[in-house]
């Protein structure tokens, strides 16, 4: 639909059009499998508009049905990682506060490649943590165009 | 200027230990990984171990996993790597080297080294 | 894992000339992952090339990388005295990352 000449002088956040793009800042200390990510112009191709971080996980300002989207590449990658030297590597997506809501949203396996990529739509409210975990010992590359997360508000 | 200075090095029995260490400076040390290259008498570049900014996620050579342990204190901008039944074959100058930020393990740069040998 | 050879083993070169020196792996280097570093006697390796073809920070321009696949070439476009040294190969795109065991150039 069309936006009156008002609604397109609104700040996008005020339309519910709520919108992240992250990179990678770091991975967790010993048993945090976490992925911790950062966003903003003065980091290259990422940004905030409405979701917000909180010590490195995204956090949900309003409510409704938003894609989710994640690429992570490993920069340390072998054709055996997912088979006799290691555990497998995967990486899941979800919901980790509040712990009322917690559930995953994606699961992801790198079977002997170095890239996975995934994206769904999904409700998500306003307060809902969303939280990346990486398995295993394995170490994504933080290169912007090999790792990123982020999310689009959809519809209400 | 980052600076890389590895200590630790010695002679030792084959199935001794020996602790190594490296201090670094002249950059963020917490947000770069780290590994340890080694590079035998006459002989080529081998990589040995890395270990994440954060300290949580290490990686073995085939050669040294079950023996060797890296671990870093990202308090006292120290690196280290625990060698445990050391063989001949470990004999080698050992280097700490900084990861690209990145994380791939190629190597911006590297500490002087220090010398492990293993004899009886 | 990825195995690299280089060659020639040995370069004889003057000052001021070109000196051609080639990486070839086993197998494919993902990404043109391939970086190569300098290395002196009683001294570490310097970083000169990575993704094959980027230069480090601080490098001069004569030094140059190319290369994809399997077959990578470092180039020198006119040798300065310090440049005679040893010059290593190393793959990063699939682990254990590897190295070559270097082409030594030369003073003639």
């Known amino acids: 639909q069309r936006l009156s000449r008002a609604q397109q002088q609104l700040p996008l956040e005020s339309l519910g059009w709520d919108i992240a793009e992250l990179q990678l800042n770091h991975t967790g200390p010993q048993q945090d499998p976490r992925l911790y990510w950062q966003g903003g112009p003065a980091l290259g191709r990422s940004f905030l508009r409405g979701p917000e971080l909180d010590k490195g996980q995204l956090r949900i300002r309003r409510d409704g049905i938003y894609m989710v989207h994640i690429q992570v590449t490993l920069a340390i990658c072998s054709s055996t990682s997912t088979s006799r030297h290691h555990h497998p590597t995967t990486l899941a997506v979800g919901i980790c506060s509040p712990a009322s809501r917690s559930i995953s949203l994606l699961r992801l396996s790198f079977h002997q490649g170095c890239t996975i990529a995934s994206q769904r739509l999904t409700p998500l409210a306003r307060g809902d943590t969303l939280c990346t975990n990486l398995t295993g010992t394995l170490l994504p590359s933080r290169n912007t165009d090999e790792t990123f997360f982020g999310v689009q508000w959809v519809r209400p | 200027e980052v600076q890389l200075l590895e200590s630790g090095g010695g002679l030792v029995q084959p199935g001794g230990s020996l602790r190594l260490s490296c201090a670094a400076s002249?950059?963020?040390?917490?947000?770069?990984?780290m590994s340890w290259v080694r590079q035998a008498p006459g002989k080529c570049l081998e990589w040995v171990s890395l270990i994440s900014g954060s300290g949580g996620r290490t990686y073995y050579a085939e050669s040294v996993k079950g023996r060797f342990t890296i671990s870093r204190d990202n308090s006292k901008n120290t690196l280290y790597l625990q060698m445990n039944s050391l063989r001949a074959e470990d004999t080698a100058v050992y280097y700490c080297a900084k990861h690209d930020y990145s994380n791939y393990p190629y190597f911006d740069y590297w500490g002087q080294g220090t010398l492990v040998t293993v004899s009886s | 894992e990825i195995v690299l050879t280089q060659s020639p083993g040995t370069l004889s070169l003057s000052p001021g000339e070109r000196a051609t020196l080639s990486c070839r792996a086993s197998?494919?280097?993902?990404?043109?992952?391939l970086a190569w570093y300098q290395q002196k006697p009683g001294q570490a390796p310097r970083l000169l090339i990575y993704g094959a073809s980027n230069r480090a920070t601080g490098i001069p321009d004569r030094f140059s990388g190319s290369g994809s696949g399997t077959d990578f070439t470092l180039t020198i476009s006119r040798l300065e005295p310090e440049d005679f040294a040893v010059y290593s190969c190393q793959q990063y795109g699939i682990s254990p990352p590897t190295f070559g065991c270097g082409t030594k150039v030369e003073i003639k």
């Open positions: 002249g950059f963020t040390f917490s947000t770069y990984a």
């Open positions: 197998q494919s280097v993902r990404s043109n992952y």
